[in-house]
């Protein structure tokens, strides 16, 4: 299918002008190639009328032009002084007329209505309000005022000053007669319907002295705004319906093949399951305007969208609406990042998030999509280092690998972490993406002690067991803080050949803190990586306590390397299930924020990678 997109149907009246905007993928080639507007003939050939290379056909001379906007990936064709002869089938496109990089546009130019002299024309969008002004002479001031609608040769009474209201206008029309001295009455019609379209007649008095005024009411369906977005990207529909519906339920719906409109989301809590995890209705402003964000755009999301207001939260005739025609470009610059990432309970996930590579300095964010009501996405972590409190010690956002991708690591997974998450930046909003985390059956590959208590001034050794499948990858320990995870210095303790024939069940990489200081308290992660790509991580919390007086019981400070499934106990720390280790306050009364700068100096923190059988090996 062609990636060029424009309006399918354009209609206008003789003598008027039209402006036709066509969209194309803004690749370097497309930006500089020829743009054209051509008319399809009976033979099927498309005859150029105007092009970006300066050509204008004789028929269009002096009344048409084509302007390219390469930075936006759009070009605009303006045609003035329209005549009925301009009605027909056209194409806007790129390159050669016959190549297929084009979009079909139907232009219909109609004859303007023949209106009686002195007719006032009112042009109003459907659902809005019109005020028809009806002047009268002094002698008709005390007499009956009325508004009629002309249908063919007959006139049907709509409203009069004797309290008659035509049933078709019930609860949405009023006739206002001003105080003395003002020789004008007004008729206000709210929530206009397409069927209200037509010629009206104001009348004051009767007989030959009556006052009459013609009004032509043109009720328009809102012209859909064309929206051109990339596959996998994000779109925002801004909906401003006016103060009069500020307190009415709002909705976004999509027009289906039956020309009815299926609710996508509304403020009453309804949401189409096809948009689960990738839609938000942002709270409305005081003026009643609101916006709907959809991420992870799919080709099947294409179509006509309407936003509106109604107490039922769905489309009803005569209520204000706004319209968009969404085109999803498959020649997307947005990469195919994962829509689902799976991890095991107790394990971890490393999520790769795309961003516009031209915006490497932008702030990166990760938020959790919550579906309740209109949906919300509270931030969990950002590249400046803020982490929501309940995620302390188990969530980190890394700028790596860079060049259009950042990484988010979440560990100590529980079934409660299953759900939808959004990758965001403070830059190009079209690059918002959604990823679903699923928790599957299985065991974490990395095994660390449940929790560890270290003794001030002593040596602490924490083991991390890893399986053979990680033997060829880099292993690391790092100290977690809310600005990231500072890698601790590693020590290569032997030849890497020790890992080549990996036939034992597991291997070991150990973290040594020597001597333990107060600043060592906190979360530590053991992980595997390959260059800038992160694999599994496991977290352990280290609590630091004073040396015990003789007679008290604690784990030998020199070693905390219990077998992977053992609980590590001490007199100062109650036994806690691994999955509950999310809040350091469960462990320690005093939480000292570690100074990560302290980690690099000297040999007080080291990582030792070895097999479980022998001390050979390295952390590569």
């Amino acid at each position: 299918k062609s990636p060029v997109f424009g309006p399918q149907e354009v209609s206008s009246v003789e003598g008027n002008s039209v402006s036709i905007k066509c969209y194309y993928p803004p690749t370097s080639v497309n930006r500089h190639t020829r743009k054209y507007w051509c008319r399809k003939g009976a033979s099927g050939r498309c005859i150029t009328l105007v092009s970006s290379e300066g050509y204008v056909s004789s028929n269009y001379a002096g009344r048409a032009n084509l302007t390219n906007f390469p930075e936006n990936g759009t070009f605009v064709v303006n045609i003035a002084q329209l005549s009925r002869d301009d009605s027909g089938h056209y194409k806007c496109g790129l390159g050669i007329n016959s190549r297929g990089l084009s979009f079909d546009v139907s232009l219909e130019v109609s004859q303007g209505p023949e209106l009686p002299n002195g007719t006032e024309v009112y042009t109003v969008d459907v659902g809005r309000t019109v005020t028809i002004k009806c002047p009268f002479k002094t002698e008709n001031a005390p007499k009956t005022k009325a508004l009629y609608k002309k249908i063919g040769q007959t006139s049907v009474l709509v409203i009069d000053s004797r309290n008659y209201v035509n049933p078709n206008y019930k609860d949405r029309i009023r006739l206002r007669i001003p105080g003395t001295g003002q020789l004008i009455f007004t008729v206000v019609i709210d929530r206009l319907r397409l069927s209200d379209h037509g010629l009206y007649l104001c009348q004051a008095g009767d007989g030959s002295n009556r006052d009459e005024k013609n009004a032509d009411l043109q009720v328009l369906e809102p012209e859909p705004e064309l929206v051109y977005e990339d596959l996998r990207g994000s779109v925002t529909f801004h909906c401003a319906l006016g103060l009069e519906v500020a307190n009415v339920a709002k909705f976004l719906c999509r027009v289906n093949s039956r020309e009815t409109c299926d609710v996508v989301i509304n403020t009453l809590g309804k949401r189409d399951s096809a948009f689960e995890g990738r839609i938000l209705l942002n709270p409305q402003d005081k003026d009643g305007s609101f916006s709907v964000v959809i991420t992870g755009l799919r080709k099947e999301d294409e179509g006509r969208y309407l936003c509106g207001a109604h107490s039922d939260g769905q489309l009803q005739e005569g209520w204000p609406i706004q319209a968009w025609q969404l085109f999803v470009n498959e020649e997307s610059t947005i990469p195919r990042s994962p829509t689902v990432v799976k991890g095991v309970a107790g394990g971890s996930v490393a999520v790769l998030c795309p961003y516009n590579p031209k915006e490497s300095q932008s702030l990166k964010y990760w938020c959790l999509w919550e579906g309740a009501q209109n949906g919300r996405c509270p931030l969990l972590v950002e590249s400046q280092g803020l982490v929501q409190e309940q995620y302390e010690g188990r969530l980190s956002l890394l700028q790596e690998p860079g060049n259009g991708t950042f990484t988010v690591i979440l560990n100590q997974l529980t079934t409660q972490d299953a759900g939808f998450y959004w990758c965001l930046t403070n830059g190009d909003t079209r690059w918002r993406t959604t990823v679903e985390i699923k928790i599957i059956e299985g065991e974490p590959n990395l095994k660390v002690p449940g929790n560890v208590t270290a003794v001030l001034g002593e040596t602490l050794n924490i083991p991390c067991h890893f399986p053979c499948k990680f033997s060829s990858y880099e292993k690391y320990w790092c100290k977690w803080s809310n600005t990231g995870c500072q890698t601790l210095p590693s020590q290569d303790e032997g030849p890497s050949e020790a890992f080549v024939n990996c036939d034992e069940n597991s291997r070991l990489v150990s973290l040594t803190l020597n001597p333990v200081t107060r600043a060592d308290e906190g979360w530590y992660w053991c992980g595997v990586k390959q260059g800038h790509f992160y694999g599994e991580t496991a977290a352990v919390y280290v609590a630091v306590e004073e040396k015990k007086v003789a007679g008290s019981r604690y784990v030998s400070p020199a070693k905390a390397d219990a077998a992977p499934d053992e609980k590590v106990l001490d007199s100062g720390v109650r036994e806690i299930e691994n999955k509950a280790i999310q809040d350091p306050r469960l462990f320690a009364e005093e939480k000292v924020v570690a100074d990560t700068g302290d980690q690099a100096g000297g040999s007080r923190a080291s990582v030792d990678s070895s097999s479980s059988e022998e001390q050979g090996g390295s952390s590569k």
Partner: nanobody
Amino acid sequence: QVQLVESGGGLVQAGGSLRLSCAASGRTFSSYAMGWFRQAPGKEREFVAVISWSGGSTYYADSVKGRFTISRDNAKNTVYLQMNSLKPEDTAVYYCASGEQPGSNRPYIPEQPIEFMPTDYPSWYDYWGQGTLVTVSS
């Protein structure tokens, strides 16, 4: 939706070879990691091998390492399992499976090593074939 159909199973003598194929329908084949599992009578389904979407990363169960080779042809939407030096204990129904893998053949989202995902668990995979029987006689 992805449909998977295995073929190539049969009876073979110990020490012999077989090549299993798995044909996938669905245009997103190239964005899925493809794995082989096997299930012997009365036993649990067991991981055999997995290959990343690009074919650049593979991972094998220790029991088949050096004897089996997994490969894929994205143009043909097919994944293969070449089985050499077959043993009687390799007798099982072999299943092909696919799971969405982080990574892409487009720029910016690079491929992570397949070992970094829990691909040795059946629940990691989204789609499964019906299986093909391999019998190794002694």
